[in-house]
Interface confidence: medium
């Protein structure tokens, strides 16, 4: 996360680190005792479950036990819109035990449309600078807002690449954004409860004024999530 402050896992108890061969790859959000929501592009190189682990319950990357993954379910890839459908579900082998530092976040409602400038939060262990640097050892957080899709698709921005199944978030002047390593983590909105309205997906650079972060719009994929679950207990 770029333009940030340190976070406590007590504040974001649904945040997990998704790791391959003990290396942090992506963030994710706990939805219930068995399921974690994340981004499909996290699994482009490796889809086998065996070397993937999930770490929950700490704001420090290396300091908490890893959880085995039972399955990874990735939505169908759409070659016409390769950045679309950036969503995946991970099923844990054993259910999580909830505590003050391990808790789920709510899915959004079908009709949850957020207007431009609505305040949102981003979190992650990703890069803190646009060009390189390294992963943060501690969880970082930042406040952003919904950026209008028309603005996001302007000629000096994403030029129509942001589809209706995506949303943009950042701050108008730039400087606050998600970055490499934050992928899969939640874009969060607080009403009566916290809702995961977006999944960190893609963007050009990190924190540029005309190119805010682009997020998978979770409400557009609720039917897909429910269709996965209809077959599961």
């Amino acid at each position: 996360v770029v333009g940030v402050e340190e976070a406590s896992v007590d504040s974001w108890p649904w945040q997990v680190s998704i790791q391959y061969d003990k290396q942090h790859v992506c963030g994710g959000s706990i939805l219930d005792p068995h399921w974690v929501l994340t981004a499909a592009h996290c699994f482009r190189k490796h889809t086998d479950v065996f070397n993937w682990k999930v770490r929950a319950g700490s704001d420090k990357l290396g300091s908490f036990p890893s959880l085995a993954v039972a399955k990874i379910i990735i939505i169908e890839f759409n070659p016409m819109y390769p950045k679309d459908n950036d969503i995946a579900l991970m099923k844990l082998q054993f259910p999580l035990t909830f505590s003050g530092t391990v808790r789920p976040i709510c899915l959004p409602f079908f009709d949850e449309e957020l207007t431009p400038a609505t305040p949102l939060w981003i979190i992650g262990w990703g890069f803190t600078k646009q060009n390189g640097g390294k992963m943060s050892d501690i969880l970082l957080q930042a406040s952003v807002q919904v950026i209008d899709s028309t603005r996001c698709n302007a000629d000096d921005a994403y030029q129509g690449e942001v589809t209706e199944k995506m949303m943009c978030a950042g701050i108008p002047e730039g400087g606050v954004d998600t970055c490499q390593g934050d992928s899969g983590g939640p874009l969060m909105y607080q009403s009566d409860q916290w809702h995961v309205v977006g999944i960190v997906s893609w963007g050009y650079g990190c924190g540029g004024p005309s190119t805010p972060g682009v997020y998978t719009k979770v409400s557009a994929y609720l039917n897909w999530i429910y269709n996965v679950w209809k077959a599961e207990l």
Epitope: H34, P104, L107, F109, Y226, K230, A231, E232, L233
Partner: antibody, heavy 118, light 107 residues
Framework: QMQLVESGGGLVQPGRSLRLSCAAS????????IHWVRQAPGKGLEWVSG????????GYGDSVKGRFTISRDNAKNSLDLQMNSLRAEDTAVYYC???????????WGQGTMVTVSS | DIQMTQSPSSVSASVGDRITITCRAS??????LNWYQQKPGKAPKLLIY???SLQSGVPSRFSGSGSGTDFTLTIRGLQPDDFGTYYC?????????FGQGTKLDIK
């Protein structure tokens, strides 16, 4: 149309066994988890057991754990509930139900009555 | 196990009334809350899933709200056909659990 039809209910003595079946039609059976829910006379609904689409995961209510076994045959579009060591408190109408959106139960059978009495 | 508590246990109302049934979970269940209607001698019928989503074919006078531990089923413009018993159910984890039911009589 989409339906579930239960069979196998009846009168049985305490300690004996009974096997309930549920036949599905009108939808792709192996796309869905299926559950058993029961209702004792004049009482509310109680979840008994459920099974995932591929039988990989099964679950049981506390009151039937160790006595009941759920199974499915996707080739035959059928679900079974083997009930052993039956007790008077197992007397109920047993429904099979399809798991769907939000893991809710969107299609229910008409129910089959099981009476456990000496 | 997660306990589900409904209130009231029974309610009597007139055609055209607006009625509210509440359901409370013993721990947070996010939005994994479903509502069913059951008529005497019949199987239950799904009304609302995911706390707020109306099941296909269910009249729009039924609506659901809530998340976390507190949930509400509202029926606006009560119809004679709406009598029966209403149940909430959590689909957050196993075992699935139901509320004890709310019996709705039409005056």
């Amino acid at each position: 149309q989409m339906q579930l039809v239960e069979s196998g209910g009846g009168l049985v003595q305490p300690g004996r066994s009974l096997r309930l079946s549920c036949a599905a039609s009108g939808f792709t059976f192996d796309d869905y988890a299926i559950h058993w829910v029961r209702q004792a006379p004049g009482k509310g609904l109680e979840w008994v057991s459920g099974i995932s689409w591929n039988s990989e995961i099964v679950g049981y209510g506390d009151s039937v754990k160790g006595r009941f076994t759920i199974s499915r045959d996707n080739a035959k579009n059928s679900l079974d509930l083997q009930m052993n060591s039956l007790r008077a408190e197992d007397t109920a109408v047993y429904y099979c139900a399809r798991g769907s959106s939000g893991r809710a139960f969107d299609i229910w059978g008409q129910g089959t009555m099981v009476t456990v009495s000496s | 196990d997660i306990q589900m508590t409904q209130s009231p246990s029974s309610v009597s109302a007139s055609v055209g009334d607006r009625i509210t049934i509440t359901c409370r979970a013993s721990q947070s269940i996010s939005t994994y809350l479903n509502w069913y209607q059951q008529k005497p001698g019949k199987a239950p019928k799904l009304l609302i899933y995911g706390a707020t989503s109306l099941q296909s074919g269910v009249p729009s006078r039924f609506s659901g709200s809530g998340s976390g531990t507190d949930f509400t089923l509202t029926i606006r413009g009560l119809q004679p056909d709406d009598f029966g018993t209403y149940y909430c159910q959590q689909s957050y984890n196993l075992p699935r659990t139901f509320g004890q039911g709310t019996k709705l009589d039409i005056k």
